[in-house]
Interface confidence: low
Amino acid sequence: GWVWNQFFVPEEMNTTSHHIGQLRSDLDNGNNSFQYKLLGAGAGSTFIIDERTGDIYAIQKLDREERSLYILRAQVIDIATGRAVEPESEFVIKVSDINDNEPKFLDEPYEAIVPEMSPEGTLVIQVTASDADDPSSGNNARLLYSLLQGQPYFSVEPTTGVIRISSKMDRELQDEYWVIIQAKDMIGQPGALSGTTSVLIKLSDVNDNKPIFKESLYRLTVSESAPTGTSIGTIMAYDNDIGENAEMDYSIEEDDSQTFDIITNHETQEGIVILKKKVDFEHQNHYGIRAKVKNHHVPEQLMKYHTEASTTFIKIQVEDVDEP
């Protein structure tokens, strides 16, 4: 009968002819009376056989990722009679994997949005690399993820590629971060290959800034002839947040005379001081009122940033008008 062990050839072998193993008949007594033949796809081009001994060699570099096994046929003939000594037999040469493929991130580019001030542990995004090497062959395709750029704000789970927040970030200081992730095969052992990807992480705004008046004192004037409803001037606060988190409402905090009102222009985010009651220079020629400003929308969990509303003092001078 035929005698052989399982045949394996490592891919990417650089030797001009690599010995794979030996096929032989147990009737072969080693006196060169038998001739071995190789048939099938790759016989004579990729693989050759020593006709006398049955030794098989690979004469080309093989790529497992292109083809992982070859099915060949063997014959053994008695040279003297020309008859087959054994029935023709099929055998397999398996191409064994080497770590010759680096992990690749196939879903690039990565981009994620996460709210500023998110707590540690918040999930940002998962990046996934794939490796063309054989997952069943040692650790050639077992990947470990690590963070090359992005500390101390981000961390990556080594086995899943899940990126999490590891330190609170303030959008008003920096609104986006480039994180560089490396995937390394061989679970990081020597001989590992790596691939890298960049992740753009943008911070979305949360209402963590209250509006603050630009001035602590505003001076306005009003003519005693001004009718009620007259706009006598504007006041302005600034808010480091953006969008609806920067929308604000102005109101009167103190006006003993109840002569003035403040309305909010929601397009410009200015406060407009309005005359609520007519003024009389001869009766009172100046007023002092206090205004405050608050954000329009403040979720309950962010109230801690908005405890004390910003206030400003407005001095209003009444201008005299000649009366008939």
């Epitope: 750029q149 560089i180 290959l193 790596s194 890298t196």
Partner: antibody, heavy 120, light 110 residues
Framework: QVQLVQSGAEVKKPGASVKVSCKAS????????MSWVRQAPGQGLEWMGI????????TYAQKFQGRVTMTGDTSTSTVYMELSSLRSEDTAVYYC?????????????WGQGTLVTVSS | HSVLTQSPSASGTPGQRVTISCSGS????????VNWYQQLPGTAPKLLIY???QRPSGVPDRFSGSKSGTSASLAISGLQSEDEADYYC???????????FGGGTKLTVL
């Protein structure tokens, strides 16, 4: 903005040594690698070696092995590059360049360069 | 002779697109990030492209980088006279355990 300020120009005789300094400011000195790169007149850039200032770990280009020594002083945020047994072909502008947090991450800031002239 | 191969010169007219290539091997470009530096006459090199295709702040989006296998390229679109400079590719080489630079490409704006 990160700043790397190098020492002034030097004129040396063949066989002598030169020590160039590079003072870093406005970043955490101990977190980043520092490389030295030189450029001979009219030639391209040539990497000489790299040092991590916190541990003093160094990796030198094969060509300069045995002739170059890189050191760091964390108290003054300064790195030094000393080249010995100078020859005329060492005449070049020597740059320090801040690397990344890994050996193989880019150089994002460069010093202004120090001209070293080797002449008898 | 450099480990990374760059053509020594390139040229273009204002507004044109120019590509500068950098060829290496598996141990450098094939397995590490490619970076590009611009060196204007008489000045220190400046980082132009990092991690294959990222631009530092302040670098116009006319500059772009790409990498494929063991080669990388730098593209400059809408060429301007101030782009006249030397351009170098650089990458860490795992076999040499050190940084390698291309020989540099002198870009002339005609």
């Amino acid at each position: 903005q990160v700043q790397l300020v190098q020492s002034g120009a030097e004129v040396k005789k063949p066989g002598a040594s030169v020590k160039v300094s590079c003072k870093a400011s406005r970043y955490t000195f101990t977190s980043y690698y520092m490389s030295w790169v030189r450029q001979a007149p009219g030639q391209g850039l040539e990497w000489m070696g790299i040092i991590h200032p916190s541990g003093g770990d160094t990796t030198y280009a094969q060509k300069f092995q045995g002739r170059v020594t890189m050191t760091g002083d964390t108290s003054t945020s300064t790195v030094y590059m000393e080249l010995s047994s100078l020859r005329s072909e060492d005449t070049a502008v020597y740059y320090c360049a801040r690397g990344g947090i890994k050996l193989w991450l880019h150089f994002d800031y460069w010093g202004q360069g120090t001209l070293v002239t080797v002449s008898s | 002779h450099s480990v990374l191969t760059q053509s020594p010169s390139a040229s273009g007219t204002p507004g044109q697109r120019v590509t500068i290539s950098c060829s290496g091997s598996r141990s450098n470009i094939g397995s590490n990030f490619v970076n590009w530096y611009q060196q204007l006459p008489g000045t220190a090199p400046k980082l132009l492209i990092y991690t294959n295709n990222q631009r530092p702040s302040g670098v116009p989006d006319r500059f772009s980088g790409s990498k494929s296998g063991t080669s990388a390229s730098l593209a400059i679109s809408g060429l301007q006279s101030e782009d006249e400079a030397d351009y170098y590719c650089a990458v860490w080489d795992d076999s040499l355990n050190g940084w390698v630079f291309g020989g540099g490409t002198k870009l002339t704006v005609l």
